[in-house]
């Protein structure tokens, strides 16, 4: 019986060009976490195997960094990064637990844009 629950950072937003940390936490189970996969819609971004470590997809290696912990850091964000992200926990003996995060990447703030211009 699967008793665990995944807590995530939920719906989050970040500025274009910035970074964001995606975090999930599995609780309420004694199951052994054997691997955590991070996915964006239909693409696998990274794998963190409990024994054999982190592996970032070549398609994302320039903009994705492992950690902290079992989390994932997305860098140099673009508006195209807006969307759903999933943390998939492979566990023994429970099986698979999935958490969902929605990321919205926003254009730089009005205040930031305004600071670039001098008032005559």
């Amino acid at each position: 019986m699967m008793t665990g629950t995944i807590e995530t950072t939920g719906n989050i937003s970040a500025e274009k060009g910035g970074s964001i940390i995606l975090q999930c936490h599995l609780s309420s189970t004694t199951a052994q976490v054997t691997q955590v996969n991070w996915e964006q819609q239909d693409q696998l971004l990274a794998i963190c195997n409990a024994d054999l470590g982190w592996h970032i997809s070549p398609s994302f290696k320039d903009r994705v960094a492992p950690g902290p912990g079992l989390g994932l850091t997305l860098q140099s964000l673009t508006v195209n990064d807006t969307g759903e992200y999933f943390c998939i926990y492979h566990t023994y003996p429970d099986g698979t637990y999935t958490g969902r995060i929605f990321l919205e990447v926003l254009e730089s703030s009005v205040a930031e844009h305004g600071a670039r211009f001098q008032i005559p």
Epitope: D42, L44, N49, D51, G53, S57
Partner: antibody, heavy 119, light 107 residues
């Protein structure tokens, strides 16, 4: 040059035990997770055990869980596989293997040691 | 566990031919696939990882492709030294499982 050298294989009776060793050299052994992969007489490959870099985490598939124990001695640069309650279906060539750096695949393999379980 | 099926246990080809070795996963493994070559009397050797990334030193006649559940290793111009067993492996979920192997024979 990365080198992995297995030893300890041999003929053992069903129900018996055997301990395999893998001597590692050419890399910082204590920085890498390690694995044992076996190849049965039909040439099928199976990952039978993994261990993290400090020995604090291990994983086994159901086929060997409770019978096999993977361990390591980082001071001796050696990986071990203790096998007990052996069955005829455990007959195989046993390889010690390591992933490549930044490579999702076993880039380094030993030459293997043959385990035969038979009465 | 994810089952990796290599439908062809044997494939026969002539030198210089193009050959494609296929592997089908029992569920979507999202390109977390590697390919190995094992020559007679030797240990397996990594050819391809992440479905299409060629490992260091692997000749460019070896190409990996695929997505979802279907993956292919293509040898563009088979050489005599390519006589070997070829295996796929998935890394998407534990335990990481291998296909049953395809033996490439040269006519």
């Amino acid at each position: 040059e990365v080198k992995l050298q297995e030893s300890g294989g041999g003929l053992v009776q069903p129900g018996g035990s055997l301990k395999l060793s893998c001597a590692a050299s050419g890399f910082t052994f204590s920085s890498y997770g390690m694995s044992w992969v076996r190849q049965n007489p039909d040439k099928r490959l199976e990952l039978v055990a993994t261990i993290n870099s400090n020995g604090g985490s291990t994983y086994y598939p159901d086929s060997v869980k409770g019978r096999f124990t993977i361990s390591r001695d980082n001071a001796k640069n050696t990986l071990y596989l203790q096998m007990s309650s052996l069955k005829s279906e455990d007959t195989a060539m046993y390889y010690c293997a390591r992933l490549g750096t930044g490579t999702l695949g076993f880039a380094y393999w030993g030459q293997g040691t043959l385990v035969t379980v038979s009465s | 566990d994810i089952v990796m099926t290599q439908a062809h246990k044997f494939m026969s080809t002539s030198g210089g031919d193009r050959v494609s070795i296929t592997c089908k996963a029992s569920q979507d493994v999202k390109t977390a696939v590697s390919w190995y070559q094992q020559k007679p009397g030797q240990s397996p050797k990594l050819l391809i990882y992440w479905a299409s990334t060629r490992h260091t030193g692997v000749p460019d006649r070896f190409t990996g492709s695929g997505s979802g559940t279907d993956y292919t290793l293509t040898i563009s111009s088979v050489q005599a030294e390519d006589l070997a067993l070829y295996y796929c492996q998935q890394h998407y979920s534990t335990p990481w499982t291998f296909g049953g192997g395809t033996k490439l024979e040269i006519k």
